[in-house]
């Protein structure tokens, strides 16, 4: 902490400007009014302060707002956000998507830090649910964001937000997460026609039950093997050879290359050899 010392004559800051970069830490502490800093936070980012100087500015804001910064200050924190701890951020009440975007921009290109995770958590909890605009914003900055949420957290995602999800956003989701997301996607895309529906729902099919896969097999969807490999084992096992053949269409030949891998291996093992032979792929149950 910086010791309390009187501001030297003529050094009292009247505005936040570049002259302050020449101030020593104790001078910043003594000569910069916290209220002035709060009202001119937008200028801080344009000034090349050292990390040590930023520590002093943060300290001044902490003294002015011991219960947490107001959103008018938070929105203009810029690089000072990197100095915040998760404990600091837990005191904030961030409601504006613009504020969230401004702070995520500061951390852009880096992995999600504990500070960012706390900020997002505060924001989403404040909104009560992950609406489409928020999800759009978060997945734009962090494509893996959706899959970092627990199944419980994902349950607060409204079906309307699913439209914002891109296939790559689901790359790291595990089966339990897809179990939660699939019914929402099914609801979101229910009014689309067959081929368009399949294009949209495909990324979510890792959460689909057997009856939905049976229904898809009647629609000439030609599911690729990569999607088939991500299906739930319990959903695949009850499918007949005929149903899998219809589901995969021309891709059925790909089963041979995956015959030693789950869930294909588990499915093959539970089929009658006579039925497998109808595929002409040499699969052994």
């Amino acid at each position: 902490e910086v010791e309390k010392t009187a501001c030297p004559s003529g050094k009292k800051a009247r505005e936040i400007d570049e002259s302050l970069i020449f101030y020593k830490k104790w001078e910043l502490e003594a000569c910069v009014d916290a209220a002035l800093l709060a009202t001119q936070m937008d200028r801080v980012n344009a000034i090349p302060f050292t990390y040590e100087q930023l520590d002093v500015l943060k300290h001044k804001l902490d003294e002015l707002y011991p219960q947490g910064y107001p959103e008018s200050v938070i929105q203009h924190l810029g690089y000072l956000f990197l100095k915040m701890s998760p404990e600091d951020i837990r005191k904030w009440n961030v409601t504006s998507l613009e504020t969230l975007k401004a702070l995520l921009e500061v951390n852009k290109g880096h992995e999600m830090s504990p500070q960012v995770a706390t900020l997002i958590d505060r924001f989403v909890k404040g909104r009560g649910q992950l609406d489409k605009d928020t999800l759009d914003t978060l997945t734009a900055f962090y494509p893996g964001y959706l899959c970092s949420l627990s199944p419980e957290e994902l349950s607060s995602v409204p079906p309307s937000s699913i439209w914002a999800v891109r296939p790559q956003d689901l790359d790291t989701c595990d089966p339990r997460q897809l179990d939660v997301l699939y019914p929402k996607a099914r609801l979101a895309f229910q009014n689309m026609n067959g081929s368009e529906y399949f294009v949209k729902i495909q990324s979510f099919l890792g959460g689909a039950p057997t009856e939905d896969l049976k229904a898809l097999s009647q629609q000439n969807v030609s599911m690729d093997l990569a999607t088939f490999m991500k299906l739930r084992t319990d959903a695949v096992l009850p499918l007949t050879v005929a149903e899998v053949q219809k589901l995969l269409g021309p891709h059925v030949e790909g089963l041979k290359a995956e015959e030693r891998h789950r869930p294909v291996r588990d499915w093959i093992l539970r089929q009658r050899q006579d039925d497998l032979d109808t595929l002409g792929l040499g699969l052994q149950g």
């Epitope: 595990d174 089966p175 339990r176 490999m229 991500k230 084992t233 319990d234 096992l237 030693r260 891998h261 789950r262 291996r265 588990d266 093992l269 539970r270 052994q284 149950g285």
Partner: antibody, heavy 119, light 107 residues
């Protein structure tokens, strides 16, 4: 609840065939969801999967042991068995039988039986 | 065959510590990864299946994460009964390989 019990000789001579049986109680070896595996663990070493069998008789073996392993199932006795031919001292291990549930993993194990290969 | 590499091979920790064990597959195995605990003279016990699902009856201090090639087993607060050897295993490929094991010892 399902329990597994291994049985068989504890001492086998080199070049002979090791034979073990696993008896399933409290459940059926003809379960749709389960395969039945043999796994071994040499003294002070890690686990090595030997192979599995499904009640239909379909088998799958560890490639490194495939030429010497035979696993069979007897649904009427609710048992499955392991035969490992041409044994050497390197086959000395604790041999476990285990249930492999398709949705979970090796969720039920026998207590293990020590088999020593020595003349 | 898919190779499974566990690290560390052994570690010393105290009761109450947070312990993390990692397992790496030589190729992608999706979420098909199981974790087992084995105590001396006993058969292994299934802790986690499908990378992150807790087996029935296993304390919630155990958790698993990961997908693809990199996986983690975490014990949030080590208890006296947790000192044991832990193995990862992949059921994705028909070779069913185990990791080499991680022995968790008392510091």
């Amino acid at each position: 609840q399902v329990q597994l019990q291994e049985s068989g000789p504890g001492l086998v001579k080199p070049s002979e065939t090791l034979s073990l049986t696993c008896t399933v109680s409290g459940g059926s070896v003809s379960s749709f969801t389960d395969t039945w595996s043999w796994i071994r663990q040499p003294p002070g070493k890690g686990l090595e999967w030997i192979g599995y069998i499904y009640y239909s008789g379909s088998t799958n073996y560890n490639p490194s042991l495939k030429s010497r392993v035979t696993i069979s199932v007897d649904t009427s006795k609710n048992q499955f068995s392991l035969k490992l031919s041409s044994v050497t001292a390197a086959d000395t291990a604790v041999y476990y039988c285990a249930r492999d549930n398709v949705f979970t993993g090796f969720d039920i194990w026998g207590q293990g039986t020590m088999v020593t290969v020595s003349s | 065959d898919i190779q499974m590499t566990q690290s560390p091979s052994s570690l010393s920790a105290s009761v109450g510590d947070r312990v993390t064990i990692t397992c790496r597959a030589s190729q992608s195995i999706s979420s098909y990864l199981n974790w087992y605990q084995q105590k001396p003279g006993k058969a292994p016990k299934l802790l986690i299946y499908a990378a992150s699902s807790l087996q029935s009856g296993v304390p919630s201090r155990f958790s698993g994460s990961g997908s693809g090639t990199d996986f983690t087993l975490t014990i949030s607060s080590l208890q006296p009964e947790d000192f044991a050897t832990y193995y990862c295993q992949q059921p994705y490929d028909a070779s069913y390989t185990f990791g080499g094991g991680t022995k968790v010892e008392i510091k």
